[in-house]
């Protein structure tokens, strides 16, 4: 028969910094040998070569050395491509072209995404506020992709659409920082919420500010950090927000700023004697020097690792001093589960089969749920194990033992409890007798 080349219809969604698999399968003829195979992955629009297999050999990546095939699976017709450390610039269509005796091709779309950070809220003016004053509330969320949708509402959930200005700027990696400004006239008191939505991930990040006018200023150094943990994806950069209220006439020469690990008191980064004293934490931290004079003591932590998770204390000393602790919660999305069946041939109703659901390189530990085709949870005869690799990322393997009915669908859902990200795989077993062909 004809050589059929198959790819997913839906775009493959990949988070920036993670690895993505562009699935492509073909139907090898009996007696097919890899020596006969020409496999080419290329960018659909520009025809730029991405990766190839020819003369019985993987000819390697022509795309920034970030691609790989699955050599052990090629002979079974799996021509999928692994794209490592996904970047915004990778977004687009990739063509998988297979030539043996016949030839064929299909294009798969890669949709890149990056979650927006929890918005930070600033108020201008932020002192001596009275009912009737006009204030500008700025909602800032960082390092997301694609462009965000921003919504404002009051404490009663009523949308605020007037006097809103939103700007989105892409950095050199193509990630967007979004700044949305709301101008409002204060009532007796009020809560203002900003919601930043990632349209691809359907991820909402929100923050709110409650303004109670006519607070008497204390004169103390107020150090403020987000109440909620900062969630950062492994391999990405995170900003640990910290702000203080500089007095009029404040100069950086007066500032002592110390970031340290809350539990061990290990020094992370410091600023003193009018100078950034640099990172004491694996050279992966940085301040925002241009913003310090305005009271922004935030810390940038680069290439986040699982081991970074925990509490960081921001200590500010000028004339007075103060500190606050911010929690960093590290996360990594779990891969789409792969499903295997044992035995996988000549299955009949009444047979006991073992279905294994495997999902990789996530953090923190996953929650695993099984259900049948009707959505009924399957809890009996499930064994789940999770193993951390040297980076602290977990591989999860969940095994379900079931007695086959006439036919049935078995779904496995791997949930990342921090990202509230669900990855699911399913297998449908029909007919008798039958052989199980795993999805490419």
């Amino acid at each position: 028969g004809a050589l059929e080349v198959q790819v997913p219809e839906d775009p493959v969604v990949a988070l920036v910094g993670t690895d993505a698999t562009l699935c492509c399968s073909f139907s090898p003829e009996p007696g097919f040998s890899l020596a006969q195979l020409n496999l080419i992955w290329q960018l659909t629009d520009t025809k730029q070569l991405v990766h190839s297999f020819a003369e019985g050999q993987d000819q390697g990546s022509a795309y920034a050395n970030r691609t790989a095939l699955f050599p052990d699976l090629l002979a079974q017709g799996n021509a999928s491509l692994r794209l490592q450390r996904v970047r915004v610039a990778d977004e687009g269509s990739f063509t998988c072209f297979v030539s043996i005796r016949d030839f064929g091709s299909a294009a798969v779309s890669l949709q890149v995404a990056a979650p927006y950070s929890k918005p930070s809220m600033t108020l201008e003016p932020n002192k001596d506020l009275r009912p009737g004053d006009t204030v500008t509330i700025t909602c800032s969320s960082y390092q997301g992709y694609p462009e965000a949708e921003v919504f404002w509402q009051d404490g009663q959930g009523v949308p605020l659409t007037g006097n809103v200005t939103t700007s989105q700027m892409a950095n050199e990696q193509g990630l967007f920082d979004v700044h949305s400004i709301l101008r409002v006239v204060l009532g007796a008191n009020g809560t203002y919420s900003c919601l930043v939505r990632n349209p691809v991930l359907q991820q909402d990040a929100h923050s709110s500010v409650t303004i109670t006018p006519q607070r008497s200023p204390t004169g103390a150094v107020e150090v403020q950090v987000p109440e909620d943990p900062v969630v950062a994806l492994v391999g990405t950069d995170a900003t640990l927000r910290c702000s203080f209220s500089p007095e009029p006439g404040f100069s950086l020469a007066q500032l002592n700023l110390i970031w340290q690990l809350t539990d061990t008191k290990q020094l992370v980064h410091s600023f003193t004697e009018g100078r950034d004293q640099g990172s004491a934490y694996a050279n992966r931290t940085a301040l925002f020097p241009d913003l310090l004079a305005q009271g922004n003591a935030s810390l940038r932590l680069q290439r986040v690792r699982v081991a970074d998770e925990g509490s960081f204390t921001c200590f500010v000393s000028i004339r007075d001093f103060g500190s606050a602790a911010v929690s960093l919660q590290v996360a990594a999305p779990y891969s789409k589960p792969s499903m295997t069946l044992e035995p996988n041939k000549d299955l009949r109703p009444g047979d006991t089969v073992t279905i294994t659901c495997s999902s990789y390189r996530g953090y923190p530990e996953a929650e695993v749920f099984w259900q049948d085709g009707q959505g009924v949870p399957l809890t009996g005869n499930v064994t789940t194990s999770q193993m951390a690799n040297e980076q602290g990322l977990f591989d999860v393997h969940s095994v379900l033992r079931v007695v086959l009915g006439a036919n049935g669908t078995y779904s496995c859902l791997v949930r990342n409890p921090v990202l509230q990200q669900d990855a699911h795989g399913s297998v449908t077993i029909t007919g008798q007798p039958m052989t199980f062909p795993p999805e490419a």
Partner: antibody, heavy 117, light 108 residues
């Protein structure tokens, strides 16, 4: 033995259309990828369209995309090339050729297409 | 698209001599290269496929060699029926699979 026979060529005015056919016999046409190749008056060979065995995938040079359409009817062992918006530079002998196993094993004798006012 | 450069464009030789025609690709085509012979007024005939394999019925005086971007067709002890034009064509990657510009072989 195996043979492919092209037909449908002739004289056509610029901007006109023409449909070429290629009848195959003596080999399992439905398992072969096929191409249309043209030879210009200066004797250069140019691949103008390619189709895989079941007709799911078609390929054209960027310069011809949108004007030429390759198709096949495996039940009739026939390959087609629909040409539209023809230009004088499309004047050539058009050959039907197999594209199986990374070789062009079977070629027809060609059909002449002349685009002229 | 991949560019194939054939050389020489033409040559005059005597019956019984040996000739070599070369085909250079603008990028690696991984031995996915065929050679054709075309006599005046006829259609091209396949001589060699996947760089080194002789097509059915082709005399052993023809031989193909090469890899990567450099390929050649050697004809030993030329016969009168060998005169005409020779073309290379690659089959690497997504079509169009381009042809070389041709080499015209004439009797001296």
């Amino acid at each position: 033995g195996a043979s492919v026979v092209e037909s449908g060529g002739g004289l056509v005015q610029p901007g006109g259309s023409l449909k070429l056919s290629c009848a195959a016999s003596g080999f399992t046409f439905s398992t072969f990828g096929m191409s249309w190749v043209r030879q210009t008056p200066d004797k250069r060979l140019e691949l103008v369209a390619t189709i895989n065995s079941d007709g799911v995938n078609t390929y054209y040079p960027d310069s011809l995309k949108g004007r030429f359409t390759i198709s096949r009817d495996n039940a009739k062992n026939t390959l087609y090339l629909q040409m539209s918006s023809l230009k004088s530079e499309d004047t050539a002998i058009y050959y039907c050729a197999s594209a199986e196993g990374r070789r062009g094993a079977y070629w027809g004798q060609g059909t002449l297409v002349t685009v002229s006012a | 698209d991949i560019l194939l450069t054939q050389s020489p464009a033409s040559l005059s030789v005597s019956v019984g001599e040996t000739v070599t025609i070369t085909c250079r690709a603008s990028e690696n085509v991984y031995s996915n290269l065929a050679w054709y012979h075309q006599k005046q007024g006829k259609s091209p005939q396949l001589l060699v496929y996947t760089a080194t394999n002789l097509a059915d019925g082709v005399p052993s005086r023809f031989s193909g060699s090469g890899s990567g971007t450099q390929y050649s067709l050697k004809i030993s002890s030329l016969q009168s029926e060998d005169f005409g034009s020779y073309y290379c064509q690659h089959f690497w990657g997504i079509p169009p699979w381009t042809f070389g510009g041709g080499t015209k072989l004439e009797i001296k």
